[in-house]
């Protein structure tokens, strides 16, 4: 499969509550978007007759507690992991380790967060410490979207940590965002 999911399970502290649409996309930059060497993505066939809306990415809900050192949220939050197929499978290799990748020449569609929501959480700390109030930003929905320069530079910044690791005989390609990004979830507190 040449289509990479985003492992969006990071929760970050934000300054204000509200709904957060994705920042406006910048103009596409084919140089950064489509090259296989950019992040180690294999090339793929361009979309021709199929509309991206015909493909469906998955919104997988997980329940977890927000932590900050020894402190833990009183109630769990629901996180969404965006994952799934945003391109025509028939144009991808028909077996892991077999087939061949098409030359890159079209837009790259990925299953990424579409909207975010903010949630206030109360963190309970051991040792009689006073509870802390925090606001966290959580993924609210996912969508198959055209990868833009904005995504390439910000959303993809964690990509490539394992880019050199070939999988099951495929060409080297990045694993999606490491869930380790969670560890920074409360380091961005304002």
């Amino acid at each position: 499969q040449g289509w990479q999911a985003f492992k969006n399970d990071a929760t970050e502290i934000i300054p204000e509550l509200g709904e957060y649409p994705e920042p406006p996309p910048e103009l596409e930059n084919n140089k950064t978007m489509n090259r296989a060497e950019n992040g180690g993505r294999p090339p793929h066939h361009p979309f021709e007759t199929k509309d991206v809306s015909e493909y469906s990415c998955r919104e997988l809900h997980f329940t977890r507690y927000v932590t900050d050192g020894p402190c833990r949220s009183a109630k769990p939050v629901t996180e969404l992991v965006c994952s799934g197929q945003c391109g025509p499978a028939r144009l991808l290799p028909n077996a892991i380790g077999r087939g061949k990748w098409w030359r890159p020449s079209g837009p790259d569609f990925r299953c990424i967060p579409d909207r975010y929501r903010a949630q206030r959480v109360q963190l309970l700390c051991p040792g009689g410490e006073a509870p802390r109030a925090r606001k966290v930003r959580l993924v609210a929905s996912c969508k198959c979207k055209r990868l833009t320069r904005f995504h390439n530079q910000s959303e993809l910044k964690d990509f490539g940590t394992e880019a050199a690791r070939p999988q099951k005989g495929r060409k080297p390609r990045p694993r999606a965002r490491s869930a380790k990004a969670n560890q920074a979830e409360l380091e961005n507190a304002y």
Epitope: Q4, A5, R58, E59, R64, S83, A89, Q167, A179, N182
Partner: antibody
Framework: QVQLQQSGAELVRPGTSVKVSCKAS????????IEWVKQRPGQGLEWIGA????????NYNERFKGKATLSADKSSSTAYMQLSSLTSDDSAVYFC?????????????WGQGTSVTVSS | DIQMTQTTSSLSASLGDRVTIRCRAS??????LNWYQQKPDGPVKLLIY???TLTSGVPSRFSGSGSGTDYSLTISNLDQEDIATYFC?????????FGSGTKLEIK
């Protein structure tokens, strides 16, 4: 190579608890979900739930809420499933499996299974 | 929850036959349909994912197809080593669900 090594068979008393482990090796543990699946003798497969080891996030099949508790230890790349208040209905083989959610959207590697027998 | 139905619980066929196992979902699962093979008292193995993609080492006599709610697994030239139980599974949304399985036997 990718391996999921499960703990050995368990013979336990009704009303007690058991904790099954699944040690992952050969891949980045936090980059894949671990799913748990139940199979009663001669029966089909039943999805219990999933854990995202990177965040500790879980999702349970409604039927197993209160019965199964999933956890993961990143430092040892091991996932755990605790089953509580055991009854004869819990006698089964329990599998852990890795879900490659960035590429395959399926459980691409499975543990060998852990047999849990609940008997007085 | 999405129900997965494998209407045939067991299937007898001769070596060399073309065998098709069907699976139906209670709602559209957008091709997130996987097939697993389990040999008697053995582990579970992923055969096909995302409807039609074979995993490494799976013989090319296996193929998968379908869309929407109806999916199938075909073995084009049945071999002795294909004797097993086959399960379909939807990976579209939690809770993931499996079909009840189809046991393949030799006539």
């Amino acid at each position: 190579q990718v391996q999921l090594q499960q703990s050995g068979a368990e013979l336990v008393r009704p009303g007690t608890s058991v904790k099954v482990s699944c040690k992952a090796s050969g891949y980045a543990f936090t980059n894949y979900f671990i799913e748990w699946v139940k199979q009663r003798p001669g029966q089909g497969l039943e999805w219990i739930g999933a854990i995202n080891p990177g965040s500790g996030g879980t999702n349970y099949n409604e039927r197993f809420k209160g019965k199964a508790t999933l956890s993961a230890d990143k430092s040892s790349s091991t996932a755990y499933m605790q089953l509580s208040s055991l009854t004869s209905d819990d006698s089964a083989v329990y599998f852990c499996a890795r879900e490659d959610y960035g590429d395959v959207y399926a459980m691409d590697y499975w543990g060998q299974g852990t047999s849990v027998t609940v008997s007085s | 929850d999405i129900q997965m139905t494998q209407t045939t619980s067991s299937l007898s066929a001769s070596l060399g036959d073309r065998v098709t196992i069907r699976c139906r979902a209670s709602q559209d699962i957008s091709n997130y349909l996987n097939w697993y093979q389990q040999k008697p008292d053995g582990p579970v193995k992923l055969l096909i994912y995302y409807t039609s993609t074979l995993t490494s080492g799976v013989p090319s006599r296996f193929s998968g197809s379908g869309s929407g709610t109806d999916y199938s697994l075909t073995i084009s030239n049945l071999d002795q080593e294909d004797i097993a139980t086959y399960f379909c599974q939807q990976g579209k949304t939690f809770p993931f669900t499996f079909g009840s399985g189809t046991k393949l036997e030799i006539k």
